[in-house]
C-alpha cells in the first residue's frame, strides 16, 4: 500500500475547476523531493503533466499549477477550464521519476446536465438577490400567480399573489408587477443561501390553460481566491461587496471549523492576535473596503471571509468574499526583532527592512493607532517632514542599497510605547510591524551631554561634550544636527586605528562638538550617538539655544574663517578645511502623490507634505563647521 494519500475519485463538470490535495509522509526527503501529477496511458506509462520542478505540459498551459506545502506535508494540483478530455486515470506522486511513491486518482468530467428546454437559468452568489421573470398570457392576468420550488415529490409554494409566503421566505420573497404590463410578473428573492438553489416553477392560472415556466436557480459560494504570502510580509484583502450593502458594517473573519471568527470590523471589534498589525479601510460608497495585515505569522494561514451586516458579524444570506491565505515560511523578508525595548529618557534605533531591489523607494515610519477602524499616520519619511510633536527626537536614516533604513527615536516616554510600521512606496509586502515597549529607567543613561542647559553666545566658541561608557569604546561616535528633514551627521576626523587600551577610565570617555564661531543657524537640536558601520545604536539629544552677546563678554576671532572645524586628538591639534554641501530644497509633490496604497495606511497623508531630503548624511543647510575632541587617557 502506498504511503501517499489523496482523493480516489474526483468528479466535476465541463468548465469547472478541481483542486486535488495529495498527502505525503512527514520526512525531510519527502518535503524537498520532486512532486508530480501524471496521466496513465493504456500502456501503463504515466506521462507527466505538471511537476514541482517547473515542468508544465502543453495541455495544461495557462490552466494548472502545482503547489507544495511542506509545513502541511501536502501538495495541491489546481486544474481549471476542465473539458471531457480531462476524464481519465492519474497519479499524484513523489520522486525523481514517475515510478516513485504515488497514489491513483480517477478524474471524471461530465457534460453540464441538460435541463428542460424552456428552463431559464439564474446564477447568483450567496447573499445576493435574484429577480425571476414570469411571463403569462393576457387571459391569465386576473388569475393567481405563484412561484413554487420543486422537491422530489411535489412543488412547494414559495409565494403567491394572495400574499401566501412559505415561512423560510418570509421577509425575503416579493411578488410584484411592473407598471401597466399585464403579461409578466416578477418574484424577487433576497439574501440567497445554498438552500435556495434548485428548480422552481412560475405559474399564472390553473389547469391546462395555466402559463408555466421552469427556472433553475444556482446559488454559488464564492470560490476562495488563493493568496500566497511570505512570512513577515503583509497581505491586503480587497473586499467588493456591492452597493446594496454600502451602508452596512463590514467585517473580516477567519474560518475556524464551524464558525467564522471576526478579526476586525468597522464597529471597533478587533482580535487581540492582530493588535498593532491590522487596518480596515472603507474605500468608497459602493461597499468596497480593504483590510491590511502586516507582520504575517505562520498561524495567520487559513480561510478568510469578508462580509457586511449591521451586526458586524457573519450572517447567512448576506454577501461574502473568501480567500485562502498560505504563508510561506521560506521568506525573503529578513527575521528582525518584532519587539524593541527602551527606557524613559533613552533611545531606540529601529532597523526597517525594505526590498533591496527598490533602494530608491520612499521610506516611511508610521504609528499604528487602534481607535476606530485603525490608521497609521506617518511620523517621518524620506520626503516627509517629522511630525511636530516629535521635534528634535525622531529621524530616519536611509542607507541606500543595503535593504535597511534606520529610524531613531530618543527622549523616550511611556507614551511612545505602541506599535509602529516600517513601509515604503514600493513593494507593499515589505511592511513590517514593530512593538515598542518603554520601561521606566532605573539607572543613568549610557550617553550624557554636558552642559545640560546649553546656551551658546553668538560669535563665540561653544563646546558640548558627550560622555560615553567603556562598552562603546570601539564604536564610532558622531554628532548630528537635527532638522525636520533628518539628522545631518557633522564631519569629524577619523582617528585611524586606535591603540588598544588595557584599562578604560569610565569617567573620561567623551566626544565633544565645538561651534566656532556660533551663528544664529546653529540654534536647534543636536544628537550625540554611536554606531558600528551602518548599524545605529544609542543616541541622546540636546537643544542648543543661541543668544546675542551681552556687553563685556569676550569675543573670539577665528584666525581662519575657512578652517572652522577642528579635531583635537590626544593633545595634537589637526586643522582641516571642511566645506559642507549646501542642501538644495527639492520641491516634490508629497510622499503620497503617486502611491494610492500608502494613502490607505494613514488618513493623515496630507499632513506629511515636505520638500528637501530627509535623514541623508550629506545634506545640510548651515555653513558652520564643527569640531570633535576625543580625549583618551
Amino acid at each position: 500500500k502506498s504511503p501517499i494519500f489523496g482523493p480516489q475519485e474526483v468528479s466535476s463538470i465541463e468548465g469547472d475547476s478541481v483542486s486535488i490535495t495529495c498527502y505525503y509522509p512527514d520526512t525531510s526527503v519527502n518535503r524537498h523531493t520532486r512532486k508530480y501529477w501524471c496521466r496513465q496511458g493504456a500502456s501503463g506509462m504515466c506521462t507527466t503533466l505538471i511537476s514541482s520542478n517547473g515542468y508544465l505540459s502543453k495541455e495544461y498551459s495557462g490552466r494548472a499549477n502545482l503547489i507544495n506545502f511542506p509545513e502541511n506535508n501536502t501538495f495541491v494540483i489546481n486544474i481549471e477550464q476542465l473539458t471531457q478530455d480531462d476524464t481519465g486515470s492519474y497519479k499524484c506522486g513523489l520522486g525523481t521519476s514517475n515510478r516513485g511513491l504515488s497514489f491513483d486518482v480517477s478524474l471524471e468530467v461530465s457534460q453540464v446536465p441538460e435541463l428542460p428546454s424552456d428552463t431559464h437559468v439564474y446564477t447568483k452568489d450567496i447573499g445576493r438577490n435574484v429577480t425571476i421573470e414570469c411571463p403569462f398570457k393576457r387571459e391569465n392576468a386576473p388569475s393567481k400567480k405563484s412561484l413554487c420550488k420543486k422537491t422530489n415529490q411535489s412543488c412547494e409554494l414559495v409565494i403567491d399573489s394572495t400574499e401566501k409566503v412559505n415561512p423560510s421566505y418570509i421577509g425575503r420573497a416579493k411578488l410584484f408587477m411592473k407598471g401597466t404590463d399585464l403579461t409578466v410578473f416578477y418574484v424577487n428573492i433576497s439574501h440567497l443561501t445554498h438552500n435556495d438553489a434548485g428548480l422552481y416553477i412560475c405559474q399564472a392560472g390553473e389547469g391546462p390553460s395555466a402559463d408555466k415556466k421552469n427556472v433553475d436557480l444556482q446559488v454559488l459560494a464564492p470560490e476562495p481566491e488563493l493568496l500566497y504570502k511570505d512570512l513577515r510580509s503583509s497581505v491586503t484583502f480587497e473586499c467588493d461587496l456591492g452597493r446594496e450593502v454600502a451602508n452596512e458594517a463590514k467585517y473580516l473573519c477567519r474560518m475556524n471549523k464551524e464558525t467564522c471568527d471576526v478579526i476586525i470590523n468597522t464597529l471597533g471589534k478587533r482580535d487581540p492576535d492582530f493588535e498593532g498589525r491590522i487596518l480596515i479601510t472603507p474605500k468608497d460608497d459602493n461597499g468596497r473596503f480593504s483590510v491590511l495585515i502586516t507582520g504575517l505569522r505562520k498561524e495567520d494561514a487559513g480561510h478568510y471571509q469578508c462580509g457586511a451586516h449591521s451586526s458586524g458579524l457573519p450572517q447567512e444570506g448576506w454577501p461574502i468574499q473568501t480567500w485562502q491565505l498560505f504563508v510561506n515560511e521560506e521568506s525573503t523578508i529578513p527575521n528582525r526583532r518584532s519587539v524593541v525595548k527602551g527606557v524613559t529618557g533613552g533611545s531606540v534605533a529601529i532597523a526597517c527592512p525594505y526590498n533591496p531591489k527598490e533602494s530608491s523607494s520612499l521610506k516611511y515610519w508610521c504609528r499604528w493607532e487602534g481607535d476606530g477602524n485603525g490608521h497609521c499616520p506617518v511620523l517621518v519619511g524620506t520626503q516627509a517632514q517629522v511630525q511636530e510633536e516629535y521635534e528634535g527626537r525622531l529621524a530616519l536614516f536611509d542607507q541606500p542599497g543595503n535593504g535597511t533604513y534606520t529610524v531613531i527615536l530618543n527622549q523616550l516616554t511611556t507614551e511612545d510605547a505602541g506599535f509602529y510600521w516600517c513601509l515604503t512606496n514600493g513593494d507593499s509586502r515589505w511592511r513590517t510591524t514593530i512593538e515598542l515597549q518603554v520601561a521606566e529607567a532605573t539607572r543613568e543613561p549610557n550617553l550624557e551631554v554636558t552642559p545640560q542647559n546649553a546656551t551658546a553666545v553668538l560669535g563665540e566658541t561653544f563646546t558640548v561634550s558627550c560622555h560615553y561608557p567603556c562598552k562603546f569604546y570601539s564604536q564610532e561616535k558622531y554628532w548630528c544636527k537635527w532638522s525636520n528633514k533628518g539628522c545631518h551627521i557633522l564631519p569629524s576626523h577619523d582617528e585611524g586605528a586606535r591603540q588598544s587600551s588595557v584599562s578604560c577610565d569610565q569617567s573620561s570617555q567623551l566626544v565633544s562638538m565645538t561651534l566656532n564661531p556660533v551663528s544664529k543657524e546653529d540654534e536647534g537640536w543636536y544628537w550625540c550617538g554611536v554606531k558600528q558601520g551602518q548599524t545605529y545604536g544609542e543616541t541622546t539629544a540636546i537643544y542648543i539655544a543661541v543668544e546675542e552677546r551681552t556687553r563685556g563678554s569676550s569675543h573670539v576671532n577665528p584666525t581662519d574663517a575657512n578652517a572652522r572645524a577642528k579635531v583635537a586628538l590626544e593633545e595634537e591639534v589637526v586643522d582641516s578645511s571642511i566645506s559642507e554641501k549646501e542642501n538644495k530644497a527639492i520641491p516634490n509633490p508629497g510622499p503620497f502623490a503617486n502611491e494610492r496604497e500608502i494613502q490607505n495606511v494613514g488618513d493623515q497623508a496630507q499632513e506629511n507634505r515636505a520638500s528637501g531630503d530627509a535623514g541623508s548624511a550629506d545634506g545640510q543647510s548651515r555653513s558652520s563647521s564643527s569640531k570633535h575632541h576625543h580625549h583618551h587617557h
Epitope: 482523493p7 480516489q8 475519485e9 474526483v10 468528479s11 466535476s12 463538470i13 483542486s19 445554498h194 459560494a221
Partner: nanobody, 126 residues
Framework: QVQLVESGGGLVQAGDSLRLSCAAS????????MGWFRQPPGKEREFVAT??????????YYADSVKGRFTISRDNAKNTVYLQMNSLKPEDTAVYYC?????????????????WGQGTQVTVSS
Amino acid sequence: QVQLVESGGGLVQAGDSLRLSCAASGRTFTTYVMGWFRQPPGKEREFVATISWSGSTTYKYYADSVKGRFTISRDNAKNTVYLQMNSLKPEDTAVYYCAASTVVADPRAPNEYDYWGQGTQVTVSS
C-alpha cells in the same frame, strides 16, 4: 449546529451488501465535508471514507482496506450521505459513525471533524 443520525446497520453474512445512511439536519448541508469512520471491537476509531464538494466538483476519499468494495455518495436534496458496502468481510464488523466538519486539513483524521452521530452497528458473520 448539525445533528447526524445514522441508519442501515445490521447483521449480515460475509459477501453480502449493506447501505448505511447519514441524515444531517441543521445548517447548510452543502458546506460540509462528510465522512464515515468505524470502530471495531476493542480497537481505535479508523477512517473509512469521506466525501467533500466544492461547487459542482466532488472529491471521494477511501481507506485502502475498503477500496473497490465501498462507495460513498450524497443526496443534497435529502441532506443525506450514504455508504454502500459490498462484499462485506468479518473484519468489517464495527460500529460505523458518520462525521461532519466545514474545514478538514486531513480527511483521514477523526479529530478534524466537529460533529458525530451516535453510530450504527454492522456485524458480518462468516
